[in-house]
């Protein structure tokens, strides 16, 4: 058993039919000795008397909130949450598994530049009785501050026959060197309590790992007199590191057609301009990445072609 | 080229080298986001590699101010990276393919500090750990965990060098 | 406004091979460009397509074939030739892409014998 | 992708219709085009997008079909019309001719 905060503990327990439980031995906070009664959650029955109270935790029915009682007066509570153990492995039941980029990813994350700050987030199908709460830090032997806001809902969607929840969280580097090459590891960790359920989930990663630029600002395009080419022209993203002599992009410009079934025309440029051919139907989109480290491709800034 | 006394280094030409390298550690070793190295406990090996840091004056006011520090730097981790991938974690079994980029990206090293440090003027080098893997499986290990760690570097040296060619070149 | 390919020869097996393609009165660089090759008595086969600058080529040409272009010219880069090669080539331009060709050059014939 | 052009070859009579065939192996909407190739010359685009008449190409001939059948209809059959007529089919990776019909008028 370990306290998660003021008042609130988490009982980790092995997963399995017939297991035996943990013994966890609740005290009253307060000076009085005598007279003192123990209830769980709404309950009127006094489950024991004294000031301490030993029970055996094996399943959610023996969680909640314990309170100690003198003469219809409360002394104090206890919120005792169960962290289950299935066959050596926490349980994960809280949030949904994105698969992204490998199986087992709970939390993910991005930034849109190396100034330290960084976006993550999560989904679940659980609707209420939920609270999540996030840490994090630069390395976890000597840790480094990184500060994150609340946790807030920040989408909703339906996947057939469920809602599916996105919770995320904004996080910064309290002394971020957008120029340095990292060693350590930025480490985020969120408790998710569900109900009477802890559950806690991990990522490690660098910056340089999660960087996703927003997609170029103010694309535009001239048509080259008499040709079917048009110069198409962009900027850098207003979000990206500066100086961009230093902190560089590399776009992507594609022409594709209505369809997807019909073939796209590609260039890649070092540049904020490229000459392409402009057809009918077509549109034309930029996206941006790293010029130096192959992280994750801006979404697309698009226009038509006509 | 950095020669002693400070002057400046062929900044466009370590520019075009170094994001030849960028390029070419990236080929080497493309499937690295597929692969969570970290989980592989590499405290001994990829800890020991010099890492261009927040002092390393490698930042844009740091360029300007006096860019010695940060082209040591830099030439350091050249110089152990180049040895690293002439060692036998690279030439040993499992051998390469005949048309890796390994090759290419250990002569580029080679290149790039050269640029950096002309005949006759030595900067300290940091020691290469020995790292001698006895089974394949560890080397092949420790060739990613480099080649990730390396690409890492070498994109640092790359916005060095092409800020400096953008605003440091005479 | 035409098309005319160039570069065709007899030549042994294995040996490479480059043939170019040249427009008047109008743009090379503002079409889609592709190449099509017929073996004598028989039918057309698609080799492969540049944009402005992305390639496409039948499974077939892959690693073999190679398309490149400069403002003026499409060039098709042809290597380890076999006598199954032996076809008139012809370059077209594309009206919107690479299956809407509207105007063919009048082929140059390349002959792959030892 | 794979073009399936039927029949290989067809006789008609002048005046008469002739109906030639593509199938292609997967969807390919109206990525579809019909030349005609007479001997010794280099092909010429009748029809794009399965069912657009190229400029100066006579009404009789006709494209239609979309997905994955696609017909070429010659009505009121002329002598010029002799010729080979191929299909080509693309999708978003490769373009593939049919096989050719020859079109003999008699």
């Known amino acids: 058993i370990w306290e998660l905060k003021k008042d609130v503990y988490v009982v980790e327990l092995d997963w399995y039919p017939d297991a035996p439980g943990e013994m966890v031995v609740l005290t009253c906070d307060t000076p009085e000795e005598d007279g003192i009664t123990w209830t769980l959650d709404q309950s009127s029955e006094v489950l024991g008397s004294g000031k301490t109270l030993t029970i055996q935790v094996k399943e959610f029915g023996d969680a909640g909130q314990y309170t100690c009682h003198k003469g219809g007066e409360v002394l104090s509570h206890s919120l005792l949450l169960l962290h289950k153990k299935e066959d050596g492995i926490w349980s994960t039941d809280i949030l949904k598994d994105q698969k992204e980029p490998k199986n087992k990813t709970f939390l993910r994350c991005e930034a849109k530049n190396y100034s330290g700050r960084f976006t993550c987030w999560w989904l679940t199908t659980i609707s209420t009785d939920l609270t999540f709460s996030v840490k994090s830090s630069r390395g976890s032997s000597d840790p480094q501050g990184v500060t994150c806001g609340a946790a807030t809902l920040s989408a909703e969607r339906v996947r057939g026959d469920n809602k599916e929840y996105e919770y995320s969280v904004e996080c910064q580097e309290d002394s971020a060197c957008p120029a340095a090459e990292e060693s350590l590891p930025i480490e985020v960790m969120v408790d998710a309590v569900h109900k009477l359920k802890y559950e806690n989930y991990t990522s490690s990663f660098f910056i340089r790992d999660i960087i996703k630029p927003d997609p170029p600002k103010n694309l535009q395009l001239k048509p080259l007199k008499n040709s079917r080419q048009v110069e198409v022209s962009w900027e850098y993203p207003d979000t990206w590191s500066t100086p961009h002599s230093y902190f560089s992009l590399t776009f992507c410009v594609q022409v594709q057609g209505k369809s997807k079934r019909e073939k796209k025309d590609r260039v890649f440029t070092d540049k904020t301009s490229a000459t392409v051919i402009c057809r009918k139907n077509a549109s034309i989109s930029v996206r941006a990445q790293d010029r130096y480290y192959s992280s994750s491709w801006s979404e697309w800034a698009s226009v038509p072609c006509s | 080229r950095a020669v002693p006394g400070g002057s400046s280094p062929a900044w466009t030409q370590c520019q075009q080298l170094s994001q030849k390298l960028c390029t070419l550690a990236w080929s080497a070793h493309p499937l690295v986001g597929h692969m969570d190295l970290r989980e592989e406990g590499d405290e001994e090996t990829t800890n020991d590699v010099p890492h261009i840091q927040c002092g390393d004056g490698c930042d844009p006011q740091g360029l300007r101010d006096n860019s010695q520090f940060c082209l040591q730097r830099i030439h350091q981790g050249l110089i152990f990276y180049e040895k690293l991938l002439g060692s036998d974690i690279f030439t040993g079994e499992p051998s390469l393919l005949p048309d890796s980029p390994v090759g290419q990206l250990h002569a580029s090293l080679l290149g790039l500090s050269q640029l950096l440090q002309p005949e006759g003027h030595h900067w300290e080098t940091q020691q290469i750990p020995s790292l001698s893997p006895s089974q394949p499986w560890q080397r092949l290990l420790l060739r990613f965990k480099i080649l990730r760690s390396l690409q890492a570097f070498v994109a640092v040296a790359a916005r060095v060098f092409a800020h400096g060619a953008a605003t440091l070149s005479p | 406004q035409s098309l005319e390919e160039s570069g065709g020869r007899l030549v042994t097996p294995g040996t490479p091979l480059t043939l170019t393609c040249t427009a008047s009165?109008?743009?090379?660089?503002?079409?889609?460009m592709t190449w099509v090759r017929q073996a004598p008595g028989g039918g057309l086969e698609w080799i492969g397509t540049?944009?402005?600058?992305s390639t496409y080529y039948a499974s077939w040409a892959k690693g073999r074939f190679t398309i490149s272009r400069t403002s003026t010219t499409v060039d098709l880069k042809m290597t380890s030739l076999t006598t199954e090669d032996t076809a008139t080539y012809f370059c077209?331009?594309?009206?919107?892409?690479?299956?809407?060709?509207?105007?063919w050059g009048p082929g140059t014939l390349v002959t792959v014998s030892s | 992708l794979v073009m399936t052009q039927t029949p290989a070859s067809v006789s008609a009579a002048v005046g008469g219709t002739v109906t030639i065939n593509c199938q292609a192996s997967?969807?390919?909407?109206?990525?579809l085009a019909w030349y005609q190739q007479k001997p010794g010359q280099r092909p010429k685009l009748l029809i794009y997008?399965?069912?657009t008449l190229t400029s100066g190409v006579p009404s009789r001939f006709k494209g239609s079909g979309s997905g994955k059948q696609f017909t070429l209809t010659i009505s009121g059959v002329q002598r010029e019309d002799a010729a080979t007529y191929y299909c080509?089919?693309?999708?978003?990776?490769?373009?593939?001719f049919g096989g050719g019909t020859k079109v003999v008028v008699v």
């Open positions: 077209a331009r594309g009206l919107t892409t690479d299956y809407d060709l509207d105007l």
């Open positions: 009165g109008f743009s090379l660089s503002s079409y889609w």
């Open positions: 540049i944009a402005t600058s």
């Open positions: 997967e969807d390919i909407e109206s990525y």
């Open positions: 997008s399965a069912s």
């Open positions: 080509l089919g693309a999708d978003d990776t490769t373009t593939v």
